[in-house]
Amino acid sequence: VPDKTVRWCAVSEHEATKCQSFRDHMKSVIPSDGPSVACVKKASYLDCIRAIAANEADAVTLDAGLVYDAYLAPNNLKPVVAEFYGSKEDPQTFYYAVAVVKKDSGFQMNQLRGKKSCHTGLGRSAGWNIPIGLLYCDLPEPRKPLEKAVANFFSGSCAPCADGTDFPQLCQLCPGCGCSTLNQYFGYSGAFKCLKDGAGDVAFVKHSTIFENLANKADRDQYELLCLDNTRKPVDEYKDCHLAQVPSHTVVARSMGGKEDLIWELLNQAQEHFGKDKSKEFQLFSSPHGKDLLFKDSAHGFLKVPPRMDAKMYLGYEYVTAIRNLREGTCPEAPTDECKPVKWCALSHHERLKCDEWSVNSVGKIECVSAETTEDCIAKIMNGEADAMSLDGGFVYIAGKCGLVPVLAENYNKSDNCEDTPEAGYFAIAVVKKSASDLTWDNLKGKKSCHTAVGRTAGWNIPMGLLYNKINHCRFDEFFSEGCAPGSKKDSSLCKLCMGSGLNLCEPNNKEGYYGYTGAFRCLVEKGDVAFVKHQTVPQNTGGKNPDPWAKNLNEKDYELLCLDGTRKPVEEYANCHLARAPNHAVVTRKDKEACVHKILRQQQHLFGSNVTDCSGNFCLFRSETKDLLFRDDTVCLAKLHDRNTYEKYLGEEYVKAVGNLRKCSTSSLLEACTFRRP
């Protein structure tokens, strides 16, 4: 088999026939050096998954539940291409599983016990697996058999396809529990009708069901969605209020050596030649000898799944939680009203050491998880491996796009009511040496630049956003002669000035000596022409305040700020000479952890915050000798956000717009992955 062959896995005679036709038609339109198809027949999807894992096949298309099976060890497959539905302009690759209720019914998600439920069918995704999986740990014990536990949880149900003899309560709202459209309450529309008729109190369906069944907005307005945070939202706000976001149908491949680029090349060419309305003789999305052979008949095309996206991220935390609960049947022993330890995400072993000290002192309230980059930490919080971390505004933006929420803000000014008064923000500045007297904001081209890290506010988003508006392209590595912007591509000129050794060179963590505010300033001191930092950086590292050898003899007066009008000012005049105001760093978490993270962090700062006077003898949460480990060292307290509890509200319209403009220059693989899930 030549190297450019994709071995497609078929699960029936009809699929194998269509696969051979696919193979032959592709041969006729693709040059001999292009990708080709070979067909491998197996007895089931699970056999296909095993065959791909064993390198006996390369690809198969699966629904969400099987994508989960494919991801589990030892299979370790990953999503590589998604089918989309709808139009090319507005492609739909996911649907949302929702809980629909009548507007005047007055209960929340955590009050479903004793209510009457309408399901599309036993064992179906949106109608059963997702809601029951998410409710699993609230079901009365014993939880097996599952149908009995569900029957005892709700006061009555219609769950088509259930065994009405053994579990009559599941068929109480639709006698007989018929498993076809002969049962008026079967399927998506049936489950909604069960709610509409007043038989049930809640219907578990998908987001489009209500629109397909009620064309009139006034009628739709009589219904609401139950959200997982125990609030309600209008039915058109399903993107912010759903039980899970579920991929419709996905091509999977091996995680390592999985030919993902070749599979995409093949399918992209296939959709060009044999996609919707392309060819009479062979149609990719049509199954004359069956239904949904190889691909769904309703699909309109394919989209490449971003490479950063593993199955856990693709399926989403809620879906994975629901399916894992159903499959593994394990629930935490702690009462649900008690907070579990908060798993803090620490960057590299530097932060890990401080985090472990915090953990030991917290007596089990804090646990530590490590990752090498901020984006890896955000991904771990998304999938539940970690719970929280404090982030610069640029990463609050990415975390927000990935569904996380800000929960507390770092405050940097001492005030009587620190915890109740979130600040307006800090200033992003451009610092130069006083001796380089000809340097201004207008002649930075060809100079050597020092940045806190790619994607961070003061060090990157603000200065590069302003620069982009001037030069109208993203080739910042050509604008500056060289620099250190941790997180840049290793061969970029923006890694040339960095000081990390070996693999740590230009890494966006403390293993790179020029990382962060202090690191960027050190880069200016030792090698650079300009450093993009926060307004407190120079005073915090001069006048003997930083005892490190490189900093101990520095004088604030030897540095100046570049103003946007082309002038320069002394460092202390930052209020009249800065690039922009930056939102303070903030702690982010998943929505489901918001209350517990808030509660535990407020307790922790009362124990280890700024009220601790002797930090050499006692653990101090906000101190790490200018390294900004876990939190900025100038943090006075963590403040409540009040109503600024989404990333857009927290960062403010102006900053969100600025980062949005810079998105075309983004190298963030995580941002690409998250915007695939939510464009």
């Epitope: 072993h349 050491l353 030991v360 002192n361 050499s616 003898g617 480990l629």
Partner: nanobody, 114 residues
Framework: QVQLVESGGGLVQAGGSLRLSCAAS????????MAWYRQAPGNQRGLVAA???????RYADSVKGRFTISRDNAKNTMYLQMNSLKPEDTAVYYC????????WGQGIQVTVSS
């Protein structure tokens, strides 16, 4: 600046024992937190054992009952007594400490053969 130097590593048979030492020099402040970490190839560095200056001790679940951390403040030295060693204990072991700053040793290899 504080320097940390590990010693006592080496090759040992499964079921055997080793005692690692970590000597701190250059410290003008008490080291408030001292810990042992380990890193096996392809894995992240993980906490093995830690002790605060107040005497609170924590062990990783995988070493509880087999490893013991202790410190001799007079000698500015920390120890890790490792008993009933298993092949999965093979790793580079790092000594780490914190006062206001954080400090790391260079690491020392421990190999447990079966």
């Amino acid at each position: 600046q504080v320097q940390l130097v590990e010693s006592g590593g080496g090759l040992v048979q499964a079921g055997g024992s080793l005692r690692l030492s970590c000597a701190a020099s250059g410290s003008i402040r008490p080291l408030r937190f001292m810990a042992w970490y380990r890193q096996a190839p392809g894995n992240q560095r993980g906490l093995v054992a830690a002790e605060t200056s107040g005497g609170t001790i924590r062990y990783a679940d995988s070493v509880k009952g087999r490893f013991t951390i202790s410190r001799d403040n007079a000698k500015n030295t920390m120890y890790l007594q490792m008993n009933s060693l298993k092949p999965e204990d093979t790793a580079v072991y790092y000594c780490a400490a914190r006062d206001l700053d954080d400090y790391w040793g260079q690491g020392i290899q421990v190999t447990v053969s079966s």
